[in-house]
């Protein structure tokens, strides 16, 4: 009695069960009462990846360089060629028939996952405490600058697109203000001295005075900080004098490079 169903890897034809062709081979002749199914190997540019009764092998996929494709894995008689995209591109679909450039993450967004030949860039919004000010397919969100670690204070808050702006603290502000105040005082004192000298040269009256040796007057002796041995003073922003700490140079601090 002719079979109605066949074993695995067989097919029913002309009331008999014939063996399917193995992967890498195509069907040429069905089995007969006397011979097994005749199968032929696929040619070099063809493949069949399953047990089959196909009379033609499938052509290997062509990785078209004009579409940005290149061969990732060469096809065999049993497997298709696997294409991938050139650097900077990724597949448009799962079948990878053409490629498109990787997406860049806009400012305010950072790269969560860098693109591959088969997947696009995955962007994520920069969370609080992070920012991205560039459009990039590689850069992650960067953390805001920590002003504290540089002995600075936040002068302008950061956003998802901008970094924080750090500024000097009160003490550092003093280092800027003190020399300015000192400079102003010095100029005033000079002006006063010049004025006093001019006044001193004017004759008081017409009566003659006894001739006196001109006495050198050092007006600077009374000026605060004129003693070279004494510590240089600093002033706070209120222009009140403060003593310069030992071991510190009396100069405006230069902010370190990041």
């Amino acid at each position: 009695e002719p079979p109605t169903a066949c074993r695995e890897k067989q097919y029913l034809i002309n009331s008999q069960c014939c063996s399917l062709c193995q992967p890498g081979q195509k069907l040429v002749s069905d089995c007969t009462e006397f011979t097994e199914t005749e199968c032929l190997p696929c040619s070099e540019s063809e493949f069949l990846d399953t047990w089959n009764r196909e009379t033609r092998c499938h052509q290997h996929k062509y990785c078209d360089p004009n579409l940005g494709l290149r061969v990732q894995q060469k096809g065999t008689s049993e497997t298709d060629t696997i294409c991938t995209c050139e650097e900077g591109l990724h597949c448009m679909s799962e079948s990878c028939e053409s490629c498109v450039p990787h997406r860049s993450c806009l400012p305010g967004f950072g790269v969560k996952q860098i693109a591959t030949g088969v997947s696009d860039t995955i962007c994520e919004p920069c969370p609080v405490g992070f920012f991205s000010n560039v459009s990039s397919a590689f850069e992650k969100c960067r953390p805001w600058t920590s002003c504290e670690t540089k002995d600075l204070v936040v002068q302008q808050a950061g956003t998802n697109k901008t970094d924080v702006v750090c500024g000097p603290q009160d003490r550092q502000r003093a280092l800027v203000v003190i020399p300015i105040c000192l400079g102003i005082l010095f100029v005033i004192l000079l002006l006063v001295l010049v004025f006093i000298k001019k006044v001193a040269k004017k004759p008081n009256d017409k009566a003659p005075h006894p001739k006196q040796e001109p006495q050198e007057i050092n007006f600077l002796d009374d000026l605060p900080g004129s003693n070279p041995a004494a510590p240089v003073q600093e002033t706070l922003h209120g222009c009140q004098p403060v003593t310069q700490e030992d071991g510190k140079e009396s100069r405006i601090s230069v902010q370190e490079r990041q």
């Epitope: 067989q10 040429v28 069905d30 011979t35 005749e38």
Partner: antibody, heavy 112, light 112 residues
Amino acid sequence: QVKLEESGGGLVKPGGSLKLSCAASGFTFRNYAMSWVRQSPGERLEWVAEVSGSGYYTYYPDTVTGRFTISRDNANNTLYLEVSSLRSEDTAMYYCTSRAYWGQGTLVTVSA
Amino acid sequence: IVMTQSPTLSLPVSLGDQASISCRSSQSIVLTNGNTYLEWYLQRPGQSPKLLIYKVSNRFSGVPDRFSGSGSGTDFTLKISRVEAEDLGVYYCFQGSHVPYTFGGGTKLEIK
């Protein structure tokens, strides 16, 4: 009506060659593997060659490998057997067969 | 693969009797897919062989139902339920499962 008709046999000297032909009709020739079977006088049948339906695969017993060549022309429904380096023991009636059907045979005699 | 038939030479029978011929292969001729290419042929005097049974037990078209085949693995049998005069000749078993294909030595069915 299936018909297989051999030709090309004859008397040949040892070391000589012949090309046997078999004209097939009455069935779809290309779908069937074809064989040549020989029979020496008063002896058993001996299978000497087979070719697959497409002509791609060929099979021989060790006794004739390298000396006999089976081939087919599916366009003309013809089977061939080229026999060379013939020996006296190759003397036999050569049958063309699809296993289901057999021709009447052609006689090959190898003699000095 | 060696195919051994018995009786080895002849089997004398009376017309109308049952006849049985055995064939044993030196190794299994069952393929992994379950197919067994065991065939039985009858060669009448002066004729080419004719197919009777294929794949162990399948009667070829036009073969009378008094012929039946059975067996598996390495042991096979051809039975003729009621022998008729036209059945006389030499019976050969043949294995087409493994190259080189081989025939049995033949059993001559003759009248007692």
